[in-house]
Amino acid sequence: MRRGPRSLRGRDAPAPTPCVPAECFDLLVRHCVACGLLRTPRPKPAGASSPAPRTALQPQESVGAGAGEAALPLPGLL
């Protein structure tokens, strides 16, 4: 399972998420959506995936999942 790219949150996304439990904040449409299908990934060992892009850190990145956390690939989810 790949890590996602470093968090890109440069939108006006609330931090932390305003969503109720079992919901996620979808940054594309900027509202809470059900994410009950999502499962927590088992992080890969360091070096087991391609490097994250070197994008500039955004102000909101310090809140929630940061660049060092494994991201769950969701091909198509939501």
Epitope: D26, V33, C35, P53, T55, G64, A65, L74, P75
Partner: antibody, heavy 126, light 107 residues
């Protein structure tokens, strides 16, 4: 193999209707958001619509809003695009595609369209 | 609606050349910019997502950079199979929008 196979295109008169289908295989369709995108002859790609994995949310491009309806049947692993009141300017190759996202904490980040169907041609002509 | 402007609209290059394509957004889109390759009669193929992340299975000669409003797709050494049209696309907000493409032709 991850695959999207499209059907349902053809020639139709202005004002009439047509339904496109997109059959998915090789991945968990019921967990996948899906898009329709179109490309008129010699023109740019144009996003048409998106539907959530559970059909709880649907969004449309302005040019098709009120005329086209995106839907899905997760029991059949199939995505649909119902096109009503067709116009000459709807003539295009239509593609279905899978939404590519990452879950980061409780945020969902969108990274485009990672699996595409082969395309189906819709010609609106009298 | 976010407008994406690609340049050039077409270019001629030879095998082995380094090719650079740019995409400019009408407003800041952070790094929510993706690149696709399309060959005649085929569907687009995702090459780069999140401005600089290489999609699985895509050769490493493709790379992307940029953030905010200005983005670049680079092909470090053009191969015969790379002659195609390249599109940028933003996934910052709906409606999703695409650039109008850059056609890479054989010189």
């Amino acid at each position: 193999e991850v695959q999207l196979v499209q059907s349902g295109g053809g020639v139709v008169q202005p004002g009439r209707s047509l339904r496109l289908s997109c059959a998915a295989s090789g991945f968990t369709f019921s967990s996948s958001g899906m898009h329709w995108v179109r490309q008129a002859p010699g023109k740019c790609l144009e996003w048409v619509a998106v539907i959530w994995y559970d059909a709880s949310n649907k969004y449309y491009g302005d040019s098709v809003k009120g005329r086209f309806t995106i839907s899905r049947d997760n029991s059949k692993n199939t995505l649909y695009l119902q096109m009503n009141s067709l116009r000459d300017e709807d003539t295009a190759v239509y593609y279905c595609a899978r939404r590519f996202t990452y879950l980061r904490g409780w945020y969902i980040e969108d990274y485009g369209l990672d699996v595409w169907g082969q395309g189906t041609t819709v010609t609106v002509s009298s | 609606e976010i407008v994406l402007t690609q340049s050039p609209s077409s270019l001629s290059a030879s095998v082995g050349d380094r090719v650079t394509i740019t995409c400019r957004a009408s407003q800041s889109i952070s790094s929510y910019l993706n690149w696709y390759q399309q060959k005649p009669g085929k569907a687009p193929k995702l090459l780069i997502y999140a401005a600089s992340s290489l999609q699985s299975g895509v050769p490493s000669r493709f790379s992307g950079s940029g953030s905010g409003t200005d983005f670049t797709l680079t092909i470090s050494s053009l191969q015969p199979e790379d002659f195609a049209t390249y599109y940028c696309q933003q996934s910052y907000s709906t409606p999703l929008t695409f650039g109008c493409g850059t056609k890479v032709e054989i010189k």
